[in-house]
């Protein structure tokens, strides 16, 4: 898909930081999502995994931002081939993994 501009990526990173900072209560009531191969996948795959979570206001902005990075409409399960060994993880861990991945991309200058 199209490469998101650097500013949009930074805004997404900042939003993920807002969600996770000093947070110990389970995000989205401990909802589980598919663990994904972020390196092989990307924004659309991350959105696909989070699409399964509904009624969680904490990640609604993240879902909207990810959809802006994805060139086509994503439906749940669309990228099931990129799920990691059919493993599910908590939303909080998914967000932390995504955050680290996006920082790595940013530092490597892939979106500058």
């Amino acid at each position: 898909g199209p490469v998101p501009p650097s500013t949009a990526l930074r805004e997404l990173i900042e939003e993920l930081v807002n969600i996770t900072q000093n947070q110990k209560a389970p995000l989205c009531n401990g909802s589980m999502v598919w663990s994904i191969n972020l390196t092989a996948g990307g924004f659309c795959v991350a959105l696909d995994s989070l699409t399964n979570v509904s009624g969680c206001s904490a990640i609604e902005k993240t879902q909207r931002m990810l959809s802006g990075f994805c060139p086509h409409k994503v439906s749940a399960g669309q990228f099931s081939s990129l799920h990691v060994r059919d493993t599910k993880i908590e939303v909080a861990q998914f967000v932390k993994d995504l955050l680290l991945h996006l920082k790595k991309l940013f530092r490597e200058g892939q979106f500058n």
Partner: antibody, heavy 126, light 109 residues
Framework: EVQLVESGGGLVKPGGSLRLSCAAS????????MSWVRQAPGKGLEWVGR??????????NYAAPVKGRFTISRDDSKNTLYLQMNSLKTEDTAVYYC?????????????????WGQGTTVTVSS | SYELTQPPSVSVSPGQTARITCSGD??????AYWYQQKSGQAPVLVIY???KRPSGIPERFSGSSSGTMATLTISGAQVEDEADYYC???????????FGGGTKLTVLG
């Protein structure tokens, strides 16, 4: 060795200004969130404010008593944190500490303010 | 503004267990951190994220949290543990830090 060294403290009259600096070494400063904390004579610790790393948005937050008077900034090229203090009041008299708020932030870890400087003393008096 | 409440003082005899509490409305969802400050020195982190101990901190220091209360426990307190202890956390937004008022731990020699 991770180290923070504050400087710039001194005696200033009420209404005056002062700029504190905090020189960092031994870690990747640009990755770290940095905080200022103060301690009035014989009193407890008081959080002053914090600045995130630029990659985390560079957001700055302040405690209510200093908002609008104090400004936190950073220069990642110089590994230095700053606290610009304007319209100083006698109640701002304190030892001011800088602290790393998130050395492991880039890796998704959070350790709290795990490294502190030795502090620099600010006295506001007429 | 958000507050964390600690007892002003706690006294124990050497070898006894000291418990210092910290209460705050956001503690069910935000982690607590504990700092030790000895006279004339900068604070030292002794517990982070409620229960974790940084390297170099003796095993007798431990932390726990339940509901709106976080607790620092020093099992077998020693004379060198005499210091001021502060809890730290953030408000519910996570954007503003706050310290408790501090607890003076006296280890009666």
């Amino acid at each position: 060795e991770v180290q923070l060294v504050e400087s710039g403290g001194g005696l200033v009259k009420p209404g005056g200004s002062l700029r504190l600096s905090c020189a960092a070494s031994g870690f990747t400063f640009s990755n770290a969130w940095m905080s200022w904390v103060r301690q009035a004579p014989g009193k407890g610790l008081e959080w002053v404010g914090r600045i995130r790393s630029k990659i985390d948005g560079g957001t700055i937050n302040y405690a209510a008593p200093v908002k609008g008077r104090f400004t936190i900034s950073r220069d990642d090229s110089k590994n230095t944190l700053y606290l610009q203090m304007n319209s100083l009041k006698t109640e701002d008299t304190a030892v001011y500490y800088c602290a790393t708020d998130q050395v492991g932030a880039y890796y998704g870890d959070y350790y709290g303010m795990d490294v502190w400087g030795q502090g620099t003393t600010v006295t506001v008096s007429s | 503004s958000y507050e964390l409440t600690q007892p002003p003082s706690v006294s124990v005899s050497p070898g006894q267990t000291a418990r210092i509490t910290c209460s705050g409305d956001a503690l069910p969802e935000k982690y607590a951190y504990w700092y030790q400050q000895k006279s004339g020195q900068a604070p030292v982190l002794v517990i982070y994220e409620d229960t974790k101990r940084p390297s170099g901190i003796p095993e007798r220091f431990s932390g726990s949290s339940s509901g709106t209360m976080a607790t620092l426990t020093i099992s077998g307190a020693q004379v060198e543990d005499e210091a001021d202890y502060y809890c730290y956390s953030t408000d519910s937004s996570g954007n503003h830090g706050v310290f408790g008022g501090g607890t003076k731990l006296t280890v009666l020699g």
